[in-house]
C-alpha cells in the first residue's frame, strides 16, 4: 500500500481467482484513543472499533472511503483504491491502446518545435467518475523539471456503438535547450482513477522523436508564362523553431488529381518554392519535415490548381 | 580545414558532408537487421557517448561568439562514432550485408573529422566505452542503439554547419 495523495491510498493486488489479497491496517488521524468506530462509504454498518482497523483487501468491494467516527463526529477519511496486477502485468483497463506506433501505446505525444513544449493525449470509452493527474520530468534518476497543466477533455468521437473521449495535456520543459542533443528522455507519467480503480501509464521519449511541424503557411501559386507549369511558394510555419538557417526544414510537394487513383507527382526540396505542372482539377499540397532528423511529416497544406 | 585556434572551417564542405551523414545514418538504421529488441531495450547504452550539450556552444549564439568549442565537441563525437562503427559491434556476428551503408557511414565520419582537424593538431578524443557484447543479439541491439544515437548527434552537427555556412562563411 502507498499514498497517492493526502488520505488516498493505493493497494496493489495480485488479481486471480482465490487470491489471498493484502492485509491493510488503517489508522485514524486523531489524538483520540477511545470510542472510535469505522464505516465504509455510505454504509452505517460498523466494521470495527479502535484507533486502527485491520482489513483484508481482496476485491473492489473492500475498497472505498473508510471513515473513523467518534460520537457521530467524523474524525478522518482514508480512500482505498485498487491497482490490479494480472499475471505479473498491471491492468490497463481505463485507457484505450492506440496501437500507433506500436501495440501497448496508451499515451501519444507530439511537439511542434524544439522549445521543450509538447502535448500528450490519450483515449478512453469511460465518461464518468474519471480523474487524471500528469507528472513529467527529463530523466528519471536525477530528474529535471517539466511542468504540465491539467488534463482536459479535448475531443469526443462516436466509434460504432461506443463514444470515445480524448484527453490531452500540455507540458513545458523548465530549462529547455533547443539546440542541444538530448541525452536523457522526457518521462511522462499519468495516474488514472476510475471509481475505485487506479492505473498508471508512462511514456518515455526524446523531443526530437515526437517533432511534427505545423503545415507550411502562405502556400501560393504563380503561373509561369506560356507554360502549364506553376511556381509554388510557401513559408516556414510560425510555430517552427528559429533561426531557420539552424532549424531547417525539408519539404515534399505533391500534385494530386481529383481521383485518389490518379498518379501523384512528388518533388522533394529544401527550398521554399518549387516548379510543378498543374493539371486541371488537381490540387497542390506541401508538407514539412525536420531536414536533418526523420521525425514526422507535418499535415499537408493544399491549394487547388485552378 | 578547421584550424583550432581561430580560422574558420570550410563551412560549406562541412555542411554538405554532414547532411550526407544524416542521410546515411537513417538509411543504415533499418538495414542492420530485423529488430524487436529495440522496442524493449530501455536502458541507455549511450550515456558514455559524447553528446552535444547545452554548454558546448553549438547554439546559434554560441557559434557566433566562438565556434571552436562546438567544433571541438563535434570532432570528438565523430572520432568516437568512427571507432564504434569499426569495432567488433559492427564487424562481428551477425555480419552486415556487403552493400550496407554502415561502411559508407564509417568513411564519411572519418572524412568530416579530417575536414575539422588539420594534420599536426590534436584535440583530445574520448575513450570508447566497454559495451562488451558477447552474443549476436546483443551486438544487434547495440547497433540499433548506436545508430539511433548517431542520428541525433549528426542532426545537431548538420544544423551547426548549415547555420555556419549561411551566416559565418567568409
Amino acid at each position: 500500500i502507498w499514498e497517492l495523495k493526502k488520505d488516498v491510498y493505493v493497494v496493489e493486488l495480485d488479481w486471480y481467482p482465490d487470491a489471498p489479497g493484502e492485509m491493510v491496517v488503517l489508522t485514524c488521524d486523531t489524538p483520540e484513543e477511545d470510542g472510535i468506530t469505522w464505516t465504509l462509504d455510505q454504509s452505517s454498518e460498523v466494521l470495527g472499533s479502535g484507533k486502527t482497523l485491520t482489513i483484508q483487501v481482496k476485491e473492489f468491494g473492500d475498497a472505498g472511503q473508510y471513515t473513523c467516527h467518534k460520537g457521530g463526529e467524523v474524525l478522518s477519511h482514508s480512500l482505498l483504491l485498487l491497482h490490479k496486477k494480472e499475471d505479473g502485468i498491471w491492468s490497463t483497463d481505463i485507457l484505450k491502446d492506440q496501437k500507433e506506433p506500436k501495440n501497448k501505446t496508451f499515451l501519444r505525444c507530439e511537439a511542434k518545435n524544439y522549445s521543450g513544449r509538447f502535448t500528450c493525449w490519450w483515449l478512453t470509452t469511460i465518461s464518468t467518475d474519471l480523474t487524471f493527474s500528469v507528472k513529467s520530468s527529463r530523466g528519471s534518476s536525477d530528474p529535471q523539471g517539466v511542468t504540465c497543466g491539467a488534463a482536459t477533455l479535448s475531443a469526443e468521437r462516436v466509434r460504432g456503438d461506443n463514444k470515445e473521449y480524448e484527453y490531452s495535456v500540455e507540458c513545458q520543459e523548465d530549462s529547455a535547450c533547443p539546440a542541444a542533443e538530448e541525452s536523457l528522455p522526457i518521462e511522462v507519467m499519468v495516474d488514472a482513477v476510475h471509481k475505485l480503480k487506479y492505473e498508471n501509464y508512462t511514456s518515455s521519449f526524446f523531443i526530437r522523436d515526437i517533432i511534427k511541424p505545423d503545415p507550411p503557411k502562405n502556400l501560393q501559386l504563380k503561373p509561369l508564362k506560356n507554360s502549364r507549369q506553376v511556381e509554388v511558394s510557401w513559408e516556414y510555419p510560425d510555430t517552427w523553431s528559429t533561426p531557420h538557417s539552424y532549424f531547417s526544414l525539408t519539404f515534399c510537394v505533391q500534385v494530386q488529381g481529383k481521383s485518389k487513383r490518379e498518379k501523384k507527382d512528388r518533388v522533394f526540396t529544401d527550398k521554399t518554392s518549387a516548379t510543378v505542372i498543374c493539371r486541371k482539377n488537381a490540387s497542390i499540397s506541401v508538407r514539412a519535415q525536420d531536414r536533418y532528423y526523420s521525425s514526422s511529416w507535418s499535415e499537408w497544406a493544399s491549394v487547388p490548381c485552378s | 580545414r578547421a584550424v583550432p585556434g581561430g580560422s574558420s572551417p570550410a563551412w560549406t564542405q562541412c555542411q554538405q558532408l554532414s547532411q550526407k551523414l544524416c542521410t546515411l545514418a537513417w538509411s543504415a538504421h533499418p538495414l542492420v537487421g530485423h529488430m524487436d529488441l529495440r522496442e524493449e531495450g530501455d536502458e541507455e547504452t549511450t550515456n558514455d557517448v559524447p553528446h552535444i550539450q547545452c554548454g558546448d556552444g553549438c547554439d546559434p549564439q554560441g557559434l557566433r561568439d566562438n565556434s571552436q568549442f562546438c567544433l571541438q565537441r563535434i570532432h570528438q563525437g565523430l572520432i568516437f562514432y568512427e571507432k564504434l562503427l569499426g569495432s567488433d559491434i559492427f564487424t562481428g556476428e551477425p555480419s552486415l550485408l556487403p552493400d550496407s551503408p554502415v561502411g559508407q557511414l564509417h568513411a564519411s565520419l572519418l572524412g568530416l573529422s579530417q575536414l575539422l582537424q588539420p594534420e599536426g593538431h590534436h584535440w583530445e578524443t574520448q575513450q570508447i566505452p566497454s559495451l562488451s557484447p558477447s552474443q549476436p543479439w546483443q551486438r544487434l541491439l547495440l547497433r540499433f542503439k548506436i545508430l539511433r544515437s548517431l542520428q541525433a548527434f549528426v542532426a545537431v552537427a548538420a544544423r551547426v554547419f548549415a547555420h555556419g555556412a549561411a551566416t559565418l562563411s567568409p
Partner: antibody
Framework: QVTLKESGPVLVKPTETLTLTCTVS????????ISWVRQPPGKGLEWLGV???????NYNSGIKSRLTISKDNSKSQVVLTMTNMDPVDTARYYC???????????????WGQGTTVTVSS | DIVLTQSPDSLAVSLGQRATINCRAS??????????MHWFQQKPGQPPKLLIY???NLESGIPARFSGSGSRTDFTLTISSLQAEDVAVYYC?????????FGGGTKVEIK
C-alpha cells in the same frame, strides 16, 4: 515448415569420437544459428555449443577441448564432433535452432526430436 | 557460468488452479534492458518446447494461460489455470552469457 533431424551412431565405445549430423529444412543456415543441447537419462538440459550464421562458434567451456561444430550451408547440415567419449556422455543429443537474433535474444525456438547416444564398451 | 536455480523442484496443483514457478539467476541476465531469459516445457519422450522468450513474450501458438515476468535475476513462469495437458517439466534458460545455461527443471503434476 521448419524441421531439424539428428542422425548418427546410437552406440559409441569409450575413447571413441562421436559424429552427429543435423539436417535442417524450412530455413537457411545463413540466417539462423544452430546449437547442440544434450540431456542425460532422467536429468536436465546442458548446452554444448553453437554455430553462428557466419560460421563462428562458441562452446561450453567444460567440454570445449573435445568439441567441434561445423556446417555446410549448401547441404543445410551441421556436424557435431565430440572426441574421447565417456559413459557419462550417454544422453539424448538435440540439434536446436536459435530464434531470430533481433527478436528472440538467444531463445531456441525449434528443436529436433533428438538422438540417443549410449557410450559403453 | 551463470547458475539458474528453479523453485520448487516439483509442484502439484489442482486442475483450473494457478501454478507459479520461479527461476533465480546467480547474476543478472539483462543486457541494456533486455532480459535474455526463456522458458521451455518438456513432456515425457518429447523435445523441449519454447513457451516464453525474453522473460515475458508468449511464443506463437502457446495458450495465453502461460505468462512470464521478471527482470535481472528473478523470473516467474505462471500458468493461470492448469490444464491436464500442462503436466510436464518446465525449464528456464539464459542466453546472456556463454555458456547458455538451463535451470534444473520443475515438475508440474495434477493434485
Amino acid at each position: 515448415q521448419v524441421t531439424l533431424k539428428e542422425s548418427g551412431p546410437v552406440l559409441v565405445k569409450p575413447t571413441e569420437t562421436l559424429t552427429l549430423t543435423c539436417t535442417v529444412s524450412g530455413f537457411s543456415l545463413t540466417s539462423y544459428a544452430i546449437s547442440w543441447v544434450r540431456q542425460p537419462p532422467g536429468k536436465g538440459l546442458e548446452w554444448l555449443g553453437v554455430i553462428w550464421t557466419g560460421g563462428g562458434t562458441n562452446y561450453n567451456s567444460g567440454i570445449k577441448s573435445r568439441l567441434t561444430i561445423s556446417k555446410d550451408n549448401s547441404k543445410s547440415q551441421v556436424v557435431l564432433t565430440m572426441t574421447n567419449m565417456d559413459p557419462v556422455d550417454t544422453a539424448r543429443y538435440y540439434c536446436v535452432r536459435e530464434g531470430d537474433y533481433g527478436s528472440y535474444a538467444g531463445a531456441m525456438d525449434y528443436w529436433g526430436q533428438g538422438t540417443t547416444v549410449t557410450v559403453s564398451s | 557460468d551463470i547458475v539458474l536455480t528453479q523453485s520448487p523442484d516439483s509442484l502439484a496443483v489442482s486442475l483450473g488452479q494457478r501454478a507459479t514457478i520461479n527461476c533465480r539467476a546467480s547474476e543478472s541476465v539483462d543486457y541494456y534492458g533486455i532480459s535474455s531469459m526463456h522458458w521451455f516445457q518438456q513432456k515425457p519422450g518429447q523435445p523441449p518446447k519454447l513457451l516464453i522468450y525474453r522473460a515475458s513474450n508468449l511464443e506463437s501458438g502457446i495458450p495465453a494461460r502461460f505468462s512470464g515476468s521478471g527482470s535481472r535475476t528473478d523470473f516467474t513462469l505462471t500458468i493461470s489455470s492448469l490444464q491436464a495437458e500442462d503436466v510436464a517439466v518446465y525449464y528456464c534458460q539464459q542466453a546472456n552469457k556463454d555458456p547458455y545455461t538451463f535451470g534444473g527443471g520443475t515438475k508440474v503434476e495434477i493434485k
